[in-house]
């Protein structure tokens, strides 16, 4: 067991022209915080795959107005560190994702908003016990600066947090800087020394004296950047003469995922499906109660209040999978029909139609209106055997010939305001929105 | 199943007080928002306060900002509404709701509807002058 700690030392505009001023106005005071999502292994760094290794949410950082002629500042960040909780080993290799959120604090249509100024993601090598790590990472024209290390919670030692660790009753015998650990008498806790001249962006190390790379990197010493320009297999451990990969066996080959799961290629590594009860990138983590948080994406926990039952996620719609950390792709099911392209939004389905028909799964030919009277400039659509009329704006009924309230209809998008017009209705868009009917 | 269960509402002289309960079966809610909507007869649902237990982040609409109070009791999985000089326009069905930012969202806000995918049964509220 043991605790991730991030600590944010800096977010403002990057380096070069084209950089914002601040993400705050004298019109929309705002302040920032942030979010940390962190993933076992190299693993994918989609935001919606499950952060099995914990997120945490930062408290929000002190109110920011930006001075009209001052020069941009870095801006003003929460106090404290992000800390995520991790239970059970640390896994030396994690991914990660960092997001920074606006609280904008002027008058809202709607109340106080939420919107993501930067997200960035990374993959690292981490041993516990270690320094501090600083990073600098850049998301367009942001930059963030931070640093991260992993500590293990007594008693608990060691790169992995897996070895337990208690001062003994007798004097120590251990030298400066380091402690005793039992379960052996005189066996001491050193802190971890690579072998020298390791690179220490690119290099890391298990055990005293050893120097392995990070992906992308190679040599003795982790500093010739890995070239695959002149290899043959995209597969395998790279090889320290050629900087190249050498084949090697498939990332689902002997089976990676525990506990019964089954695992399937992806481009880049593989994908464990795990059965519930277990998640993490290789399946691994289990005993999950529902106090883990074991439901990503706004999904809910029911039952599991103890390890030995189970619980159950009831997923949000759009997400599948018994942690909820599968985002559906709608799309595959080809609900649109005569040819209707699909798009989901996301927050919704939408089907863009082939001239001739029309209605939200494209399913009415228009072409069967024919004959068919709509008054007032209404377009007949088919439905069922019998037609209807689809109204202009402005009118309603059977035939479009009965007035009616363009606004009814809600028809402007996020939170827009809809102002009924002699010539139809306008929509006021909500901060950070625009078009006709506020869709974008 | 999911279940979002509200109590404690009732009739009320103008001027009185009223705690509302939201009781979350099964499920522990520390990464979601817990939120208090309203909704009074021919007007759209509006939402009035929501926490986040995790940070204990608070947001009050500015109709019931230094009357009301939303509170938690992470142990009991209850959110609470402590509503002191009810007034007439009070009057509505309240609803508890669970939910927050969806994934890959880039806008959000916390007293609107859209992001929060659980919702209670309601319990009425009616404040009379």
């Known amino acids: 067991a043991g605790v991730f700690e991030l600590q944010i030392h800096s977010f403002g505009p990057g380096p070069g022209p084209g950089a914002p001023r601040s993400p705050c106005s004298a019109r929309l005071p705002c302040r920032l915080f942030f979010r940390v999502c962190l993933k076992p292994g190299l693993s994918e760094e989609a935001a919606e795959s499950p952060c099995a290794l914990g997120a945490a949410l930062s408290a929000r950082g002190p109110v920011y107005t930006e001075q009209p002629g001052a020069p941009a500042p870095d801006l003003p960040l929460p106090d404290g560190l992000l800390q995520v909780p991790f239970r059970d080993a640390w896994p030396g290799t994690f991914s990660f994702i960092i997001e920074t959120w606006r609280e904008e604090l002027g008058d809202q249509i709607g109340g106080p908003a939420w919107s993501l100024l930067a997200r960035v993601a990374g993959r690292r090598r981490l041993a516990a016990g270690g320094p501090w790590a600083r990073d600098i990472q850049r998301a367009g024209a942001w930059e963030l600066r931070f640093s991260y290390r992993a500590r293990c919670e007594p008693p608990a030692v060691g790169t992995a947090c897996t070895r337990l660790c208690r001062p003994r009753s007798a004097p120590s015998r251990c030298g400066p800087g380091l402690r005793p650990c039992a379960p052996l008498e005189d066996e001491c806790e050193a802190p971890l020394v690579c072998r020298a001249g390791c690179s220490p962006e690119h290099g890391f190390c298990e055990q005293p004296g050893e120097c392995r790379c990070l992906e992308g990197w190679t040599g003795p010493l982790c500093t010739v950047p890995v070239s695959t320009s002149s290899c043959l297999s995209p597969r395998g451990p790279s090889s320290a003469t050629t900087g190249c990969l050498v084949p090697g066996p498939g990332p689902c080959d002997g089976n990676p995922c525990a506990n019964g799961g089954s695992c399937s290629e992806t481009p880049r590594s593989f994908e464990c499906t795990c059965p519930r009860g277990f998640y993490g990138l290789r399946c691994e983590v289990s005993g999950v109660t529902c106090a883990d948080g074991p439901c990503f994406n706004g999904g809910l926990c029911v039952g599991g209040a103890d390890p030995d039952s189970a619980y159950i996620c009831h997923c949000p719609p759009g997400f599948q999978g018994s942690n909820c950390e599968k985002r559906v792709d709608r799309c595959s099911l080809q609900p649109c029909r005569n040819g209707g392209l699909c798009l989901d939004l996301g927050h919704a389905l939408r089907c863009r139609c082939r001239a001739g028909f029309a209605g939200p799964r494209c399913e009415h030919d228009l072409d069967d209106c024919a004959g068919r009277a709509c008054a007032n400039g209404g377009t007949c659509v088919e439905g069922g055997g019998a037609h209807r009329c689809s109204c202009a704006l402005g009118f309603g009924g059977r035939d479009c010939r009965e007035r009616a309230d363009p606004c009814a209809a809600r028809p402007c998008a996020h939170g827009g305001r809809c102002y009924a017009h002699f010539s139809g209705l306008v929509c006021a868009c909500a901060p950070g929105y625009m078009g006709a009917r506020c869709e974008f | 199943q999911v279940h979002l269960m509200e109590s404690g509402g009732g009739s009320v002289q103008a001027g009185g007080s009223l705690r509302l309960s939201c009781a979350a079966s099964g499920y522990t809610y520390r990464s979601n928002f817990m939120g208090w909507f309203r909704q009074a007869p021919g007007k759209e649902r509006e939402g009035i306060a929501t926490?986040?237990?995790?940070?204990?982040?608070?947001y009050y609409a500015d109709s019931v900002k230094g009357r009301f109070t939303i509170s938690q009791d992470n142990a009991k999985n209850t959110v609470y509404l402590q509503m002191n000089s009810l007034k007439p326009e009070d009057t509505a069905m309240y609803y508890c709701?669970?939910?927050?930012?969806?994934?890959?969202?880039?806008?959000?806000?916390?007293?609107?509807?859209?992001?929060?995918?659980?919702w209670g049964q309601g319990t009425q509220v009616t404040v009379s002058s």
């Open positions: 926490i986040h237990s995790g940070v204990a982040t608070t």
């Open positions: 709701a669970a939910g927050g930012p969806p994934a890959n969202a880039d806008r959000w806000y916390p007293l609107r509807p859209p992001g929060y995918n659980y």
